[in-house]
Every structure is written in C-alpha cells, then in structure tokens.
Interface confidence: medium
C-alpha cells in the first residue's frame, strides 16, 4: 500500500476530470462530491457502511438495498411482464466513457437506451452503469443475492424518467423514482467477447479518477440472454445518500465472465482517506452489506414460461459463488428403480457445475425404516464413470431414502442431490408443496433443487399437528467445507408417512407449513453461513445460464443410440456431449462393496472426471449440450442389472448392501430385465412401486454439525 501525506482537506471524489470538462452538455455526475462537502464514505473502516447513517440519514431507512431475494417468498406479479428495450441493440457511440470513481467503475452512457414495462411507471432512460465485485478468483462480490447465493460481479444500470426530469441527478436530488437493473456475472471457462470493450476500458482506468472512452459495445449483449425471469422490489441506492427511490429489476440469469476477465476488476485501484493520510489501495469488495427486507414484498416476473427452465440450475445447482463452500453443484437426475424383489438401483448424473474439479467419486447415502427403527448407511461409489449403484437385501415393507454427494479432491464435497424416497406400493410423489400421483417408477420431475438437509442431529418436531422424527446420518466428512454437506438424507418415519396420507386415502395438497421453515440451530462450534433454498415444484435440470432446456426426458435404453461421437475443439466445446449417459459405459465387472459398517471405513475414493461448467454465453456452445437450445436435457439411463439374484429372503432383517453395477455385454440400447426371473406385477416391487421426493420448503444450513467419516455410525 502506498501512503502519502496530503496537506489539504482531501476530497477524494471531486468533479469529474478532463473528460467531463469536454462535455459541457453532460448532466452526469458520478457520486460527485461538491466542494461544499458531500460526506466522505467508504466500504470499510471508520467511514464504512455501518457509519453511513451518521451523514446520510436515509441509509438507516427500512426500505434499503441490496437484499437477499428468497425465491420461494417472491410472489408472481401479473403486472411484471416482458421488458421493452429500445436502443439496447445499437452499438455504443465513441462518446461513451468509463471512469474510476474510487468507489466503483462507472460507464457514462451517451446514447439513448430506454426501458419500459416490468411495472416501471413510464419509459425510463439509461444513464450509467456501475459495477460491484469481490477480491479475487471469483469471490463473492455482488450486492444482491438469490437464496443466499452471491456472484463474483454485479452490474447495475441506472435509469430515470426523462419525461419528468431533465437529468438523472435531478431525479435523485428531488427524491423521485429511478429505475435500476441488477445483472449478475458468473465465472465461465472462456472469455465472454461481449465484455471485451468493458475489460479493455477497465485497463485504462486502473487508477482513481482515470477516465477513458470505450470501444463500441452493444448494451444488450451485457444482459442475460433470457430477460424474462427477473425479480422486482422497491429499494434504495446502495451507496450514500441511500435514497429510497429505486425500482429494482434483478435478473435471475447471470452473464458469463472468465477468470481472466475478472482480473481486470481486481486490478482497479482507489485512494482511501484516513485523516490526512491518503493511501492507494486496490478497489475490492465494493459492495454494501445486505439490508433487511422488512415489510417489503419481492415479486417475480409473470413472463410466460420464463421460470420453467430456470429453477434447478439456479436454486440448488448454484451458479453463484460457491468456491469456498462446496466443490460442485449437486448430482442430478436422481432415479431409483427396483431391479427385483430385493434390490433397488440408484442412478444419477454428474453435477452441472464443478467449482473445484475433479470429482473423484460419489457417496450414496441411504436410510430406511423398519418396525419404527431407523437405519442408515453410506456407500462410496468408487468410480466417476458408472453413475449408479445397486442396493441389495432390501425389504419391500420398508421406506428407503437415497441421496448422493460428489466427492472431490481434498475431501471437498458437493451439495447433496435431491432425496429420493422409495416404498413398495406407494403411489405418490411428494413434489414441492403438493403430492401428485405417479406412473411407473421414473425419474422424478423434481430436481436437485429439491434436496435440502433436513436435520443436524436427532430431533423431533411437530408442525401443523404432525410429528416428525429426523435422524442424521454419518457422511464421512471432517470439518465441513460446505454449509449443506454436514448432514445426509434424514429418515422420514412411518409417522410422517401416515401424516402425509400414505397409509391410504388421497391427499390433494400438502401445506408447506408442515415442513419446519427453519432448522433448529445445533450448538456447533463453528457455524456455517445459513442459506435458504426453494423446494420447487417445477425444477428441471438446466444446462446453465442463458441456455434454455426442455424438461428432462426419461426414454430408457434409447440414449446410447442417440449419442453421437462428436469431434471436440481444442477447447472442448462439445466435450460433454450427452454427458449424463456415462452410466452406459461399456462392459464392466466391478467389485462389490458392502455398505459401510460401524467399525470400518468406506472404500477409498478414486479418480476424476470431466464435468459441465457454468454456461459460457448465449452464442457459445455449452459443453454437454447441443447448440440447439430446444434440445431436451438428457437423463441418466437406468439399466437393469441382468444377473442380480436375491441374496437373502425378503423377510430377513439383514441390512441392505450396496453393490456396484454388474453388466453383461448386451446391447446398450435396450434395457434388460433380470435374467433369472422377469419382474411381474406379482413381485413385491411391482409396477405399482413408486418413489417420492422429499422437498422441505426451506433449506437453512446454519449450525450444521460436521459428521464422522464414512461408515462410522453414531
């Protein structure tokens, strides 16, 4: 840090410099400090956000920004329809310029960009763009968040109504409504060429007060490809004077940016004022802490179908900054199928986003109830190729819960997959806040977004008059590096099933209040930051931001035939084509693993594998997805093992064991039934066997206890 002494009252943000002087017609002033002394403020220290209220009273208001947006608390507002953009597709003129204000980097827009719709009271004109970022390597830097997920960068575009005011500054000074769009930037493997003019400009304003003209850019290309899914709320400026005059539009889909491009933000300098000492420091973490929602309501857009593609990949396949917590988003496409009367097959697909590659292996956690007793096991799937496992020795009259977690290097873990419940003759799926009838066992329409850690210890709660008993399972984790990885699928007892009406009779709906909205806080020595995740009713696996995907298909046994061997570019554009089909990998005969017992550890993990990463922009090929955005997401096929015999009588009390799949050299395009005895409707696991998805209404991981190593049962 460079320090130098100034012998005059330092005004760290004076009038805009040379560029401003050449624009006498400009009414733009970026957080301008007049000589009369607009209050000095900073993002930390003695002039930090907690002190803003002393000089800007509005900063202590009850409708402040930014906020954390909880998707499941947001109501759909019919008035929030499509945004109308005008001028956004035009190239910017050579008068557009960028300035390092010392608090942000701002783009002063010199062209006419208008927005209307989205409930805005009129036609608003874009005035400026500002950025907020973190400190390094994609760390959290956004001001807003969704379900607790923050992003490396947030871009904010500010608008005013030119029919009411002659300038943006006038609107603010007269405390009149302005508009603001918040756009998240998320790390992607490759550079986003649309950002090139911005990144180039950043390199020209490294130092405080520097200004530069920008190369032409298209503002629309800095927005998400899909604009239909957005949140709306009324809030404030996120910097002093914190005026509560802002109609916020927060886009749910992020824009891709590479690590390399992020470095341009992290390279910006500012000058800080402490008494008479001015220091030159990096401008980093220039975000305001989040504010209370208080009595406000967050709305979400009512654009037709805008949210259908967006739930799974965002809400629990986070595209937000998770680098410090988990190594990947959850395994997806969970499926449970009966193989015969004493065996179940669990299959899944690789996570869509890997923060810390590679995945070494997977841990399957399963639990069951028998005569009111609750038992649980964890099993390490010692492969990154064959994404399925067989649980043998199952008992048809027990309820089974399954969930899967990826294990990465350094024992980092992914978020958990959704939990699948399986019980013979059960004919309902619990999906979000409703229970629906199902057909034959198939992939759940719910997604990994639906999984939530249910407990952090043994607790019994009563909600809406229905008692629940939850028992955590050992997961094989040391100190948790993920807020959500400290628990494994908790047992839902038969009491719960009775409460849900599974003992007979139909339930047409299931109140979300039945699930506790907050987990009891365990007295953990070190608490994880809590976050809440929606249990959605329409969550579909998605390829990532800015790519639309139709609902997952479940065309068993057909995928291999559809799979084409593509030639990938040097950067692997099509590297993960049809990646979910890896379980169809050729003949194998793999070792059988018994579920970990209390006195032994699970098999050692093994190797890595490729995985899809966050999407790379609307016009680029997404690894693992066809360029055709209408192509359906593929599903994990569930081949039936041909040679698995019942190992014990179904009536025995022997706990289930998990085995890796055994294959014969049969045609991979056709599913096979067990060779010894085809399943019939008379089998204990019949066509009427179903599975259920547990979707607690909220996920909060605060106070989760870390658990012992695999197989060490408590």
């Amino acid at each position: 840090v460079l320090h130098y002494v100034v012998c005059f009252p330092a005004l760290t943000e004076g009038y805009v410099g040379t560029l401003q002087e050449s624009r006498q017609d400009s009414s733009v002033q970026i957080r301008r400090r007049k000589a009369s002394g607009d209050p000095y403020w900073a993002y930390s220290g003695a002039y930090g956000p907690e002190h803003w209220v002393t000089s800007s009273v509005s900063c202590g208001g009850s409708h402040q920004s930014p906020i954390d947006i909880l998707d499941h608390h947001a109501r759909v507002g019919d008035e929030y329809q499509e945004l109308q953009l005008d001028g956004f597709d035009n190239e910017s003129s050579n008068k557009t310029w960028m300035k390092n204000t010392g608090k942000t980097v701002a783009i002063l827009l010199k062209d006419d960009y208008f927005v209307s719709g989205a409930g805005l009271p009129g036609r608003f004109k874009a005035e400026k763009v500002e950025f907020h970022w973190g400190h390094s390597n994609g760390s959290a830097g956004s001001e807003h968040s969704v379900n607790g997920r923050r992003f490396p960068v947030e871009m904010q575009i500010f608008f005013y109504n030119p029919d009411d005011f002659d300038s943006f500054q006038t609107a603010i000074s007269e405390n009149r409504i302005i508009g603001a769009m918040a756009i998240f930037f998320q790390v992607s493997p490759r550079d986003n060429s649309a950002l090139d003019p911005i990144i180039h400009g950043l390199k020209g304003v490294v130092h405080h007060e520097k200004e530069t003209f920008l190369d032409p850019f298209i503002l629309r290309d800095l927005l998400p490809a899909s604009l239909g899914s957005y949140y709306r709320y009324t809030g404030s400026l996120t910097t002093p004077p914190c005026s509560e005059i802002v109609e916020w539009i927060v886009f749910r889909r992020p824009v891709p940016i590479s690590y390399h491009q992020l470095e341009a933000f992290y390279s910006i300098f500012t000058t800080e004022q402490q008494d008479h000492v001015k220091s030159v420091e990096y401008l980093r973490n220039n975000f305001r802490p989040q504010q209370a929602l208080n009595d406000r309501v967050v709305s979400k857009s009512a654009v037709r179908d805008a949210w259908n593609h967006d739930l799974a990949d965002f809400l629990d396949n986070p595209l937000g900054t998770e680098a410090s917590k988990v190594c990947s988003s959850p395994p997806i496409h969970m499926k449970v199928q009966p193989l015969n009367q004493t065996a179940l097959q669990v299959s899944w697909s690789q996570p869509e986003t890997i923060y810390h590659p590679p995945i070494m292996n997977y841990m399957i956690s399963y639990s069951w109830t028998k005569n009111e007793d609750e038992k649980e096991k964890t099993f390490t799937k010692d492969s990154d190729k064959d994404l399925k496992a067989t649980i043998s020795h199952v008992s048809p009259d027990s309820l089974y819960l399954f969930r899967v977690q990826a294990v990465c290097r350094n024992d980092m873990r992914s978020d958990f997959s959704q939990t699948m419940l399986f019980q013979a003759n059960t004919t309902r799926i619990f999906q979000g806040t409703r229970i629906v009838k199902t057909g034959v066992p198939t992939a759940s329409p719910a997604s990994s977004a639906d999984m939530a850690p249910i407990s952090s210890g043994s607790s019994t709660w009563t909600s809406s008059g229905i008692p629940f008993s939850f028992v955590s399972m050992a997961t094989g984790m040391g100190p948790s590096s993920s807020g959500s990885q400290a628990t494994v699928a908790s047992v839902v007892t038969s009491t719960l099933l009775a409460g849900l009406g599974f003992g007979g009779g139909g339930i047409s709906s299931f109140p979300s209040t039945v699930w506790p909205t907050r987990l009891p806080t365990a007295s953990a020595a070190s608490k994880q930051a809590g976050r809440t995740v929606l249990a959605t009713t329409e969550a579909l696996a998605s390829p990532g931001p800015d790519v639309h995907s139709a609902p997952s298909k479940d065309s068993e046994g057909t995928e291999e035939g559809e799979k084409e061997e593509k030639s990938e570019s040097e950067d692997g554009e099509r590297e993960h084509e049809e990646e979910e089909k890896d379980s169809e990998k050729k003949e194998k005969s793999e070792a059988t693993h018994t579920a970990a017992e209390s006195d032994r550890t699970a098999p050692a993990p093994t190797p890595s594998s490729p995985h899809r990463t966050a999407a790379e922009g609307g016009h680029q090929t997404i690894p693992g997805r066809r360029q055709d955005h209408s192509a359906p997401a593929t599903d994990q096929p569930g081949h039936v093992a041909p040679d698995l015999d019942p190992l014990v009588d179904t009536a025995t009390q022997v706990p289930p064991t998990a085995t890796e799949e055994h294959y014969s050299g049969s045609d991979p395009r056709r599913p096979e039934m067990p060779s010894k005895k085809p399943m019939s409707r008379g089998d204990r696991f019949s066509e009427d066997s179903k599975f259920i998805t547990v979707n607690p209404a909220e996920k909060n991981t605060s106070g989760m206890l870390s658990r012992p190593s695999p197989g060490r049962m408590e």
């Epitope: 010692d382 194998k588 050692a604 190797p607 990463t613 690894p623």
Partner: antibody, heavy 120, light 111 residues
C-alpha cells in the same frame, strides 16, 4: 492462440536448486489444472505434479518434498526443484488440462519442453 | 501404487489396423487418455475420456474401453503414425491425486 512455453532449463551441478517457469498465453491459469511432466532421455513420460485453478497442489509420491509447484501470476506457473541428482536430467514439460472442469490427465496444450541437465 | 501397463513395442503394416492396449487393475472405473509423441516433440492428445477425440485428430484414431483394458485403435496406419503412444489415467482419494502415465508403446509402421 493458446500456448505454453517453458523456460529456465540449463545445466546445473547436483544439489543445485533450479526453478522452471511455464508461461501461458491466450488463457488464464486461474481456470485450469496445470501439470508438470518430465521425460528422461530415451524414457517415457513421468508426471511430476499439478496446481489447480485455486492454487492447490498435488504431487507424485516420488516428487514430494523436492519439487514445488506455484502459481506466480495468472499466466505463469513455476516448478522449483531442489536436491537435484543426475537422475533428474530430463526434458520438462508443462501441460494444461483440456477443460477447466475436466481433470483426468487429458492435456491438450503442451509446451515444447525445456531441457534440464544435472551433471558434475 | 497404481500402474498402467502397455506393451513396449508393436508393429503394424502400412494401411493395416493396429490396437494398442493399456491395462490396470481398476481401469474399468477410470477414464483413459491417449497421447502420441514423436521424437523431439511434445506429446499430442489423441483420445480422452476413453473414446473422445479432440478436434484436429484424424478419425483413424479411436479409443475404447472394456473391463480393465483401454484400447487405442489406429485404422489404416500411415508412416507418419510411427511414434510412441502413452495412455494416461488418474488415481486418488482424499487429498491425494495422481496423474499416471503408462510406460508407452513404440509403434513401428512397416512396409
């Protein structure tokens, strides 16, 4: 174009520490696993270790303690070698994984290599 | 420790098809990559994830895997295919992570 280039290879006497540098162009090292691989004259390829995008390092068992990989910037990775013996004479390559979230020893970009000769 | 085994040398007649193998105890649970290296040059990635070909690699090169054996098949062998071929996989658990190279196979194209 994306490329790698090693530098720092030279003739040194046994026991002399040596640092090799791998310089990337066209991409950021924050996004990829970067491995060092060596090849003794007339022998096969031998993996030394890697550094991932987040700066975590992993080494072959024989390399632990004597070899250190570090990321010195978004475009350079160093391999520091100590306690060198004649057995360490080899061409040293740096190599980049094909895909940022792909880590199965699929290196699609290699440097041309730099020769390190240990001789007394 | 984990070892990938490759035949030291293989001969093939010009225009014929040749298969190079790579075996390991648990290769069925691992992905293999294949490299070609010509004298004095850096290796070139031919196949990754058992079967996938990077762009620019001729489709005469193909990969497969069955059980604990990964195979690189070169159809219509050409004189320019004479080189050393290495298979690679990964191994690891917990904080351990290794990239493992096979010993290499020297392919000679005759005729």
């Amino acid at each position: 174009a994306q490329s790698l280039e090693e530098s720092g290879g030279r003739l040194v006497t046994p026991g002399t520490p040596l640092t090799l540098t791998c310089t990337a162009s066209g991409f950021s090292l924050y996004s990829y696993d970067m491995s060092w691989v060596r090849q003794a004259p007339g022998k096969g390829l031998e993996w030394i270790g890697l550094i991932d995008g987040g700066g975590n390092t992993y080494y072959a068992s024989w390399a632990k303690g004597r070899f250190t990989i570090s990321k010195t910037s978004s475009t350079t990775v160093d391999l520091k070698m100590t306690s060198l013996t004649t057995e360490d004479t080899a061409t040293y390559f740096c190599a980049r994984e094909l895909w940022p979230a792909y880590s199965s020893g699929a290196f699609n970009i290699w440097g041309p290599g730099t020769l390190v000769t240990i001789s007394s | 420790s984990f070892v990938l085994t490759q035949p030291a040398s293989v001969q093939v007649n010009l225009g014929q098809t040749v298969s190079l193998t790579c075996t390991a105890d648990t290769l069925s649970r691992r992905y293999a990559s294949w490299y070609q290296q010509k004298p004095g040059q850096a290796p070139v990635l031919l196949i990754y994830r058992d079967t996938r070909r990077p762009s620019g690699v001729p489709d005469r090169f193909s990969g497969s895997s069955s059980g604990n054996t990964a195979t690189l098949t070169i159809s219509g062998a050409q004189a320019g295919d004479e080189a050393d071929y290495y298979c690679v996989t990964t191994d690891g658990s917990g904080s351990s992570y290794l990239v493992v190279f096979g010993g290499g196979t020297q392919l000679t194209v005759t005729g």
